[in-house]
Each structure stands twice: as C-alpha cells, then as structure tokens.
C-alpha cells in the first residue's frame, strides 16, 4: 500500500505566441481545481475509461479575476498535494490524466458552472520510494507544471512497496538473511510470510501464505507470464505452459463494489458502477455533495446541498455516468453510410465522405459522370466516386483531349523503327528480328524462335501492333 | 553527515574512456536525483545530466547525449559517470552533485562531492 | 537552450562594501533560479534558491532577488571569506545552465 503524491506548480500560458485568453474576468471571476486520474501499466489514456489505480479532486484554488488588457498569468493554484492512495503493489508504470477545471463564480442559477480549460495526460516509469519526478505538459496554448513521485505506506518498502518492514528485534543488526530497510534504518525486512516460492519480483502478500500477482503474471506463484493470444475460454486454459490466466474466480466474484454498485468485468480487472452518492474504485467513498463538484466534463451538479441528501449530474451531450465521467462512443453506431469516416467532435458528430459520396451521413451518391464529358467520341465511366473517360483509339489523357503519340514509349526492340498509325503503331524491326514490337530473334536458318511467322507475313515484314 | 565522496584523479589518451565513481553517505541514497556536472580549467560549470538512483531513469544534455552514460549501483550506494570516445577537451573537474528534491519545481545540487580531475593528453 | 549571462565578470571591493552581481536570462525563467559560491579549488556551494530564499546555514549578508529574466545577488557587507567566483543557474527546464560566474576580489 502507499499514496501517488501530485504537487502542481504552475498553470498559465505556454511559451510562444498565441498566448490564451484568461478564463476569468470581473464580470465572470472564477477559480481553478484540478482532478488526476491514474491507471497501472501503459494502458489507454482515453478519458473515459475508469481510473483503476485511483483518482482525486484538488482544493478550490483561490478566487481569481483578471485584470483588463493584462495577459493571461499564472493562475493561483490551490493549496496542497493531490493524493491518490493505492491499496496493491505499485506497478512501476502508470498512466495519468491531469484535467485542469474552472469554476465560475457568477451568478449562475443552480450555483456554480464548471468547465474543463485543460486536460494532459501521459505514460512514466516511477518506481516508489524515489525523488519527485518534474514534468511539463502542454494543451494547446496552455502549460501545466508538475511534480510527482509515490511513496510507500509503512510497514511497505521497495519500488513496488511489495516488502514489509518490521523494527529491530535487536538494536545492531537485522535477524539472519534480512536487510536494514531504507529509508528505515532503524527497521529491518519483515521475514518472507508469503507462500513458499513466491516469487519476489512479480508476486506479493498481504496475509501469511498468499501469492497474489502483479499486472501481467499468473500461476500459483506468480511465476509464468500471461499470454492473452492463446487463451480459449473466456478467462483461458488452466494451463502452466501456455501462461493463459486460470480460470477460477472472477474479478467480479463477490462482489467488490461496495454501497450497492454494480460490478462488471473488464478485460484487465472489473469496474463498479456506483449509485448516486458514492463513487471510487469500489464505490467506498461516500458524503459528496455539489460543493465537491463531482461532476466532470462540464456536468451540472444539481441537488445534494448536505451529504446524506444524493446529488444528480446533468451531463452534456457526449458524456454520460453518475459523474459525467464516460464518454459516449456516439461513432460506434456507425452512423456515417457508404465507408464514410465518423468524427465525434464533442459538440456534434461529423462524416467525412469517401470521393462520390456526400450528405451529413454521406447518404447521397454522387453521380460521377454528370456533367463530365469525354472528347473525341471516349466514354465515361463511373466508378469508386471518380469519374473516368475509356478514349477512342487514338486519343488518351483525363478527357481524352490529348492525342496520342503511340510511339512515345519507344515500343520497337532491338532498333525496329516505330510508325504511328491511324489504329495504333507499326514496328519495322531490324534484320534479324520480328514480332510485332520485333522482340524475337529469328534463327540463322530461317525459322523463328517462335512456331512460324503468322501466314502472308515474312520475317523482317513490318509488324503491325494493333 | 551528508556527503559524496568521489573516485581519484585520471590522465587518458584521446579516444580511450573514463569512468568516475561517486558514493554517497549520510541520507537514502535512492530518494535524490545526482547530477554531474563539469568544469575544465579556467572556466565557467556545465551541466551534463542527472540519474535518478532509484529507477535509473537518466536525462543527458544535448551535448554529451551518445558519449555519457550514467549509472548506479544501490547496494553500495554509488553513482557512475562514464565518458566515451575522449577528446583534449573533456579535461576538466568531473562533480557529481546531490538534488535537494523539494516538492516545488526544482532542480538544482545542495550538496557537492570534492570531484575529479580527469586529464586527456597523447 | 537558455543563456544565462552574468556581470560583471570580474570586479573588486573593499572589505564592508556592498557587492551586487546581475544575472540575466535570455527568456522568461520566472524565479527558477540559484545562486552558487564556488571558492578557488573547492566545489561550488548553494547559496541562494527560487531567486531569493537562504538555503540552510548561509549567512543573511547573501542575499537574492529578481523574476522573470533580470536577477540580482547581493553581499550586503563584503567579508574577506567570501572571496571566490559566483555562479547563476536556472531550472526553468532542462538543460540547466549556468551564468559564466563573476570573480568577486578584495581590492
């Protein structure tokens, strides 16, 4: 167990022009808060997924309203860290979504309005128990400053806070095979309590005899890598050698969502859905009212004005959740005809037409060769939402205004001479050599290398190349 | 007390390499980011990277990207600093330099090692 | 990269007086700034950090100020000790630089 520790430093314009316009003013004055969201491993960044190492919501910074004509500043930051405890093994590496929001303090009806200014977010390497890592990122003409690390909760130790510590027995020196534990000196590692066989680096316990593994590691002993291409049964085949998790009990089983949420599985884990009131990793955090903002993506939070009376989030159009907190995938309907692309800009859902096609959903199938006319007696051809011209002998290029000059390409070999033809080109081939592009040899005997020259032509005829 | 103690002084020949120890003692050795830092004769301090000893986790400057390679060894409590492919003017005093790791945006060294003179001549 | 560039280079005064050194980076750093005292043949010491806060143990003669790209060191009261070559450095971001030091005398 151990707390993420996130300490932001600064918000306010990035380097270079274009600086943003402040998001608050006199008549509209406003302050910040922030929310962090993490998730183990390299795993998606998408906003909507849940936030299953945890997540937290910052103070309300202080008020703040802009002074006319000056620049967007830094603005004034709330106090304090943001902590997101965990409960497991850190796993080393994590994503994080950092949103920025803006609380406007006019005088909305139904109180305050929030609005997301920024949102970043990222994936790092943090081993706990280390230094505080500094990171800039940057949305669009905004910068955010930050800093984090994570530190284990004691009796935890290690990068993973995976080894317990214990103090002294005795006031020298650790008990046989035990090492001082750091920063601790002063305490020693707690002898091995998990199963014999554990293994160190991919499992951990939290009670006498157990194994449990970290992200990515299966088997009795946390031993053998989990392989998700090779897996038949839904949870895979209890099998050592393919390295495919065992089925057995699933994340769900016994349900770990507390307050009465809903559990369903995901791929890596489960996720709770939880009812008004309560929200978490496990639905274990409860007393939210309004004044905590629980509403994101610009929800409006309307009734819980104490905490045992539950609050609702009005969520905008593309957010969905007891928090706004899911993105609705509006493109998965597939809305868009004919190989169209699906945009979901938020606001609005826009379809981005294959050549040929258009309409909103590009519905109307454009007809390629209205209007188009090909010379000199070529034909078009539709097709693939472009339109194509078949030219008359003779003649080529998009229209079929070109003439064609059939000997262009030099199409007579071995130094036969080209004449253009009204029906195409003629090749009169060198001595020696005959076809109609004067490509076969003819032998010293008179015979060709082909069966014989078709009748009333000698070799050496001009050829003519339809 | 806090301290870092580093390796003796070296003389090398052009294209050869060096690899200069820092220990440190007095404080968790993994909870500080060690900087290096450099400074050839008569001249002003450059900034060559730091390490994180806890992960590992390097940041190079532009410069010395490709020729430095910073390491370190937890269970002495040592960092490493070593450079490839030596010219006549890497000759300079070699610091490895503790980071105070403040929570705030910061980087800087509150705590220095005596350093080492390395010297490069054919 | 940022420059740093401090002056004067060089300069020397009297036991007692006042010694002000100017750092000037070449965009804006906010007040990520240090100063250091490094004395002949000895590795640098921190003095001065966020552009004006006494790191631990320094004596309050030192002093710092500044934000933005314009900083100033001061010695309110030169002591024979504080003889040595100063030095600004920036952590607005990586990499760090440093100014090219300014070698405080006694006259």
């Known amino acids: 167990a151990g707390v993420f520790e996130l300490q932001i430093h600064s918000f306010g314009p990035g380097p270079g022009p274009g600086a943003p316009r402040s998001p608050c003013s006199a008549r509209l004055p406003c302050r910040l808060f922030f929310r962090v969201c993490l998730k183990p491993g390299l795993s998606e960044e998408a906003a909507e997924s849940p936030c299953a190492l945890g997540a937290a919501l910052s103070a309300r910074g202080p008020v703040y309203t802009e002074q006319p004509g000056a620049p967007a500043p830094d603005l004034p930051l709330p106090d304090g860290l943001l902590q997101v405890p965990f409960r497991d093994a850190w796993p080393g590496t994590f994503s994080f979504i950092i949103e920025t929001w803006r609380e406007e303090l006019g005088d909305q009806i139904g109180g305050p309005a929030w609005s997301l200014l920024a949102r970043v977010a990222g994936r790092r390497r943090l081993a706990a128990g280390g230094p505080w890592a500094r990171d800039i990122q940057r949305a669009g003409a905004w910068e955010l400053r930050f800093s984090y690390r994570a530190r284990c909760e004691p009796p935890a130790v290690g990068t993973a806070c995976t080894r317990l510590c214990r103090p002294r027995s005795a006031p020298s020196r650790c008990g046989p095979g035990l090492r001082p534990c750091a920063p601790l000196e002063d305490e020693c590692e707690a002898p091995l309590v998990c199963r014999a066989g554990c293994s160190p680096e991919h499992g951990f316990c939290e009670q006498p005899g157990e194994c449990r593994c970290l992200e990515g590691w299966t088997g009795p002993l946390c031993t053998v890598p989990v392989s998700t291409s090779s897996c038949l049964s839904p949870r895979g085949p209890s099998s050592a050698t393919t390295g495919c998790l065992v089925p057995g009990p699933g994340p769900c089983d016994g349900n770990p969502c507390a307050n009465g949420g809903s559990c369903s599985e995901t791929p890596r884990s489960f996720e709770c859905t939880c009812p008004r009131g309560f929200y978490g990793l496990r639905c274990e955090v409860s007393g939210v009212t309004c004044a905590d903002g629980p509403c994101f993506n610009g929800g409006l939070c309307v009734g819980g004005a104490d905490p045992d009376s539950a609050y609702i989030c009005h969520c905008p159009p593309g957010f969905q959740g007891s928090n706004c907190e899911k993105r609705v995938d509006r493109c998965s309907l597939q809305p868009c005809r004919n190989g169209g692309l699906c945009l979901d800009l938020g606001h609005a859902l826009r379809c981005r037409c294959r050549a040929g096609f258009a309409g909103p959903r590009c519905e109307h199938d454009l007809d390629d060769c209205a209007g188009r006319a090909c010379a000199n007696g070529g034909t078009c051809v539709e097709g693939g939402g472009a339109h194509r011209c078949s030219c008359a002998l003779g003649f080529g290029g998009r229209d079929c205004r070109e003439r064609a000059d059939p000997c262009a390409a030099r199409p007579c070999a071995h130094g036969g001479r080209c004449y253009a033809h009204f029906s195409g080109l003629v090749c009169a081939c060198a001595p020696g050599y005959m076809g109609a592009r004067c490509e076969f040899p003819v032998h010293p005997d008179g015979a060709s290398a082909l069966p014989a020259a078709p009748p009333g032509l000698r070799p050496g005829d001009p050829q003519r190349y339809l | 007390q806090v301290q870092l103690v580093q390796s003796g002084a070296e003389v090398k020949r052009p294209g050869a390499s060096v690899k200069v120890s820092c220990k440190a003692s007095g404080y968790t050795f993994t909870g500080y980011y060690m900087h290096w830092v450099r400074q050839a004769p008569g001249q002003g301090l450059e900034w060559m990277g730091w390490i994180d000893p806890n992960s590992g986790d390097t940041n190079y400057a532009q410069k010395f990207q490709g020729r430095v390679t910073m390491t370190r060894d937890t269970s002495i409590s040592t960092a490493y600093m070593e450079v490839n492919r030596l010219r006549s003017d890497d000759t300079a005093v070699y610091y490895c330099a503790r980071d105070p790791n403040r929570r705030s945006w910061y980087y800087g060294m509150d705590v220095w090692a005596q350093g080492t003179t390395v010297t490069v001549s054919s | 990269d940022i420059q740093m560039t401090q002056s004067p280079s060089s300069l020397s005064a009297s036991v007692g007086d006042r010694v002000t050194i100017t750092c000037q980076a070449s965009?804006?750093?906010?007040?990520?700034l240090n100063w250091y005292q490094q004395k002949p043949g000895k590795a640098p010491k921190l003095l001065i950090y966020d552009a004006s806060n006494l790191e631990t143990g320094v004596p309050s003669r030192f002093s710092g100020s500044g934000s933005g790209t314009d900083f100033t060191f001061t010695i309110s009261t030169l002591q024979p000790e504080d003889i040595a070559t100063y030095y600004c450095?920036?952590?607005?971001?990586?990499?760090?630089?440093f100014g090219g030091g300014t070698k405080v005398e006694i006259r």
């Open positions: 450095q920036h952590y607005d971001n990586l990499p760090l630089t």
């Open positions: 965009q804006d750093i906010r007040n990520y």
